[in-house]
């Protein structure tokens, strides 16, 4: 059961896991939601009732009945973990933090502008997790404007006091906001020689490095597989850490793989969702239940739907005995990987996939494209809207990419006459325009937002943001697509489409069914050449075919140019303008979506 | 129908500077690129740059780059070209292009080309 | 910047016969090309576009073919007006650049 709401002056009694110190009860509960055992949670505020050591503390707790028995004590707050719940989850906190000082480890200091800029800096350093700003108030003359980045060990505050004229916060890095490159590549045969901060059991280098993205000190890892020559290190995934923040020595070994953490492409990748199935693979650890089950997908969701499980091992049944169905150990560990793995017994085993809601809803892997042709089939691009306008008559105005659950991103230069959100309707999971009838439902559009450096299209910020209504279900015909990562600005993407019903403002002529074209980019260099008239920006990206023959006017204004990148979709386009449609054949100009990542979230993170 | 009417012949000394005009009419003005092609004595065509007259953005052939600048006066609808550091052999007919195309493309209608004479 | 080399520089062609005109790019323009006509003391005029459309107005004696480097102008059945300078010019890539001309007159 779900239970958002926190309980005041409230503690819950025993279970105790560990202690962390946390500035609020709000950040408490994220932090118990994301531990691998944590279910409950009592935060102590600061009150003249409370000895001053015990404020801001966050007791971590545990309970095979999912509850505690609740005791009255003035200050606590206590609450249950999100991972009852099915919503999505997110570790960002934006929030400042007044008159605390969050302590740790304070391995930088320098002068900074203001807390903004301190936090921003802490975002951009690979081994922040926190800070601490004195502000221009404060009495000692010499820590005016002080910017100390923090680490510890946990990735929170090792304690908080209270301090007059001082703000604290955390890194952004967990809101997509850190400019740190996102380097996704596995090396095999590589060892990194730095220090090991923990080490745990893996299946495979693909789950160690999302457990070292999620681990709050590991910038790298090694994995040795199962054919590591030393038997006590098979499937063992060390989390590794160095000053500099790069592996400091690469040794060459077969049968051991390293790579990087994640924690800079964490907004469009998985990280926390393992969702692969291990055969011949025994996962060991505290068994919590043994059930029967029809198969090792049936295990899975089992174990999904038990709160407290975080693997599984099934043993499928012998023969005909117990009407088919085999054995479904449901298992639990205290950092929620397997105590051992061992092989070549039979089992099949995997992970819960109730951590999935944590990762961003755009990673979840799609229908496997239809290779071929240039229409669409319904499910191939899930994010695709149509957007309407009423006025003067009911007609398709432009693309929109759904990107959050209330938020459609399109072109700015769609809303030219657009005198009110009223008239603009929103259609989900639509392929044929002429499914849409009177009675089709649609999303209605609460508000527009332009980029306010928007003049025309030409000129670049052609961006906009439509807030929804009412918020979108999402299925497999209605879901978002990850905007790309700002690490990831150098990724060369090779798998592009746009899409679209082929509606631009000079032609009337629309396509009934969405149509996609797979085109290359362009270079900007490349671009600017053809468009000798006009200033290809930064904030721009061009794609289309040297030589022509094929159709950019299938993408409307304000669709999606969607790039697939380690087999995760990508928003890396917004179709802006050019001349595609005409006998010559330049390069489409699109709005390069990563350049306004910080907008986009600014504006769809806005309290 | 579309017209670009020039500015008169220009004789400069070298080292000076020329501004030739351009007056844009029958079209609006800001949908279409003007772009400057010079001729000398005898020669072939040779672009010297590009101004959107909408946007105000220029894009200069490297050959002019440091001694070139295109301005407009959309409220004229006219565009300008001015010349610096004159040499003799800047002597040609300079004329202003409508493209073909929003965004680029052939040229298809021209000025009548100003003659710049520079001779000391 | 690309190179467009016109071929022949001059040519004289009867009245009534087929005058023939060529444009080597020195790497592909795509379909980028287009054909000026200049007579003496007046600007050039816009003849083809994209390779082969005639521009509005244009006789249809006047054609234009080809593909990636090379290209020709082809004039079915000469008349006296068309003696002139041809010049073609590649749009595919900034810096617009022209051929050297082509002075065809009447023999």
């Known amino acids: 059961e779900c239970v958002t709401q926190l309980l005041k002056d409230t503690c819950f009694e025993g279970g105790d896991i560990t202690t962390v110190f946390t500035p609020s009860a709000k950040y408490c509960q994220v932090v118990c939601t994301y531990h691998p055992r944590c279910l409950l949670f009592t935060f102590t505020a600061e009150s003249p009732s409370e000895d001053p050591t015990r404020w801001f503390t966050c007791v971590l707790k545990d309970s095979v009945t999912e509850t505690l028995p609740r005791v009255n004590r003035t200050a606590a707050i206590s609450g249950y973990s999100f991972k009852q719940c099915s919503h999505q989850i997110s570790a960002c906190n934006k929030d400042i933090y007044v008159d605390l000082d969050m302590k740790g480890i304070n391995y930088n200091s320098s002068v900074a502008k203001s807390a903004q800029e301190c936090q921003e800096r802490c975002t951009d350093d690979v081994h922040c997790h926190f800070f601490t700003y004195a502000t221009r108030q404060f009495p000692s003359l010499e820590h005016r404007n002080i910017c100390l980045l923090k680490h510890t060990q946990t990735g929170t505050p090792t304690r908080i006091t209270k301090l007059d004229k001082v703000v604290s916060g955390f890194s952004l890095k967990s809101c997509a906001l850190s400019n740190l490159a996102c380097i996704r590549d596995i090396f095999p045969n590589t060892v990194f020689a730095d220090s090991n901060i923990d080490s745990v059991m893996a299946p495979d280098a693909f789950v160690c490095g999302r457990i070292c993205t999620h681990h709050p000190g590991c910038l790298f890892f090694t994995f040795f597989s199962q054919e590591w020559p030393k038997e006590s290190q098979r499937n063992l995934c060390l989390l590794k850490t160095s000053e500099s923040g790069l592996p400091s020595t690469r040794i060459k070994k077969s049968k051991a793989l390293s790579g990087f953490s994640l924690q800079s492409c964490r907004h469009s990748i998985p990280v926390f969702c393992h969702s692969s199935f291990y055969h011949d693979t025994d996962f060991l650890g505290e068994e919590l239940d043994i059930v029967a089950a029809k198969s090792h997908e049936a295990c899975q969701k089992l174990c999904t739907n038990a709160v407290r499980c975080q693997f599984f091992t099934y043993t499928p049944a012998q023969a005909s005995c117990n009407e088919g169905k085999g054995k479904c150990y449901l298992k639990l560990s205290s950092n929620g990987s397997p105590t051992k793995i061992l092989h070549g017994r039979g089992g099949i085993s995997g992970y819960t996939l109730r951590l999935c809601k944590m990762d961003n809803e755009c990673t979840t892997k799609i229908k496997p494209r239809i290779v071929g042709g240039t229409a669409s089939v319904r499910g191939e691009w899930p994010w695709q809207v149509t957007l309407h306008t009423t006025s003067p008559t009911q007609r398709h105005l432009c693309g929109g990419s759904i990107i959050g659950n209330q938020w459609i991103l399109t072109a700015a230069h769609c809303f030219y006459g657009v005198e009110s959100p009223k008239i603009l309707r929103v259609y989900s999971g639509i392929l044929n325009q002429s499914e849409i009838k009177e009675d089709t439902s649609f999303f209605g559009v609460q508000e527009i937002i332009i980029h306010d450096q928007y003049k025309m299209a030409e000129s670049g910020y052609d961006i906009a943001l439509l807030k929804l209504e009412t918020t979108v279900n999402y299925t497999d015909s209605q879901r978002p697509i990850c905007l790309p990562s700002k690490g990831d600005r150098n990724v060369i993407y090779t798998d592009c489409w746009v899409t679209g019903w082929g509606y631009r403002k000079l032609r009337d002529k629309i396509q009934n069914t969405l149509q996609k074209a797979k085109i290359p980019l362009v270079t900007n260099e490349e671009c600017q050449k053809r468009y000798r008239g006009h200033k290809i920006t930064h904030k721009m990206i061009c794609a289309g075919y040297r030589e022509g023959g094929k159709d950019a006017c299938k993408g409307d204004s304000g669709g999606p140019l969607s790039c697939k990148h380690n087999e995760v979709w990508h928003l890396v386009g917004i179709t802006s303008w050019g001349e595609g449609c005409a006998q010559r054949e330049r390069p489409g100009v699109y709005t390069n979506v990563v350049e306004y990542v910080d907008w986009i979230l600014e504006k769809t993170q806005a309290v | 129908q579309v017209q670009l009417v020039q500015s008169g012949a220009e004789v400069k000394k070298p080292g000076a500077s020329v501004k030739v005009s351009c007056k844009a009419s029958?079209?609006?003005?800001?949908?279409?690129?003007i772009e400057w092609v010079r001729q000398a004595p005898g020669q072939g065509l040779e672009w010297m740059g590009v101004?959107?007259?909408?946007?105000?953005?220029?894009n200069y052939n490297e050959n002019f780059k440091d001694r070139v600048t295109m301005t407009r006066d959309t409220s004229i609808s006219t565009a300008y070209m001015e010349l610096s550091r004159l040499r003799s052999d800047d002597t040609a007919v300079y004329y202003c292009?409508?493209?073909?195309?929003?965004?680029?493309?052939?040229?298809?209608?021209w000025g009548q080309g100003t003659t710049v004479t520079v001779s000391s | 910047d690309i190179v467009m080399t016109q071929s022949p520089d001059s040519l004289a062609v009867s009245l009534g016969e087929r005058a023939t005109i060529n444009c080597k790019a020195s790497?592909?323009?795509?379909?980028?090309v287009a054909w000026y006509q200049q007579k003496p003391g007046q600007p050039p005029k816009l003849l083809i576009y994209?390779?082969?459309n005639r521009y509005t107005g244009v006789p249809d004696r006047f054609s234009g073919s080809g593909s990636g480097t090379d290209f020709t102008l082809t004039i079915s059945s000469l008349q006296a007006e068309d003696v002139a300078v041809y010049f073609c010019?590649?749009?595919?890539?900034?810096?617009?650049?022209f051929g050297g001309g082509t002075k065809l007159e009447i023999k």
């Open positions: 292009a409508r493209t073909y195309g929003k965004y680029g493309g052939a040229m298809d209608f």
């Open positions: 029958g079209y609006t003005f800001t949908n279409y690129l």
């Open positions: 101004i959107n007259p909408g946007s105000g953005y220029t």
């Open positions: 790497q592909s323009v795509s379909n980028d």
């Open positions: 994209y390779i082969s």
């Open positions: 010019q590649q749009d595919y890539s900034s810096p617009p650049t």
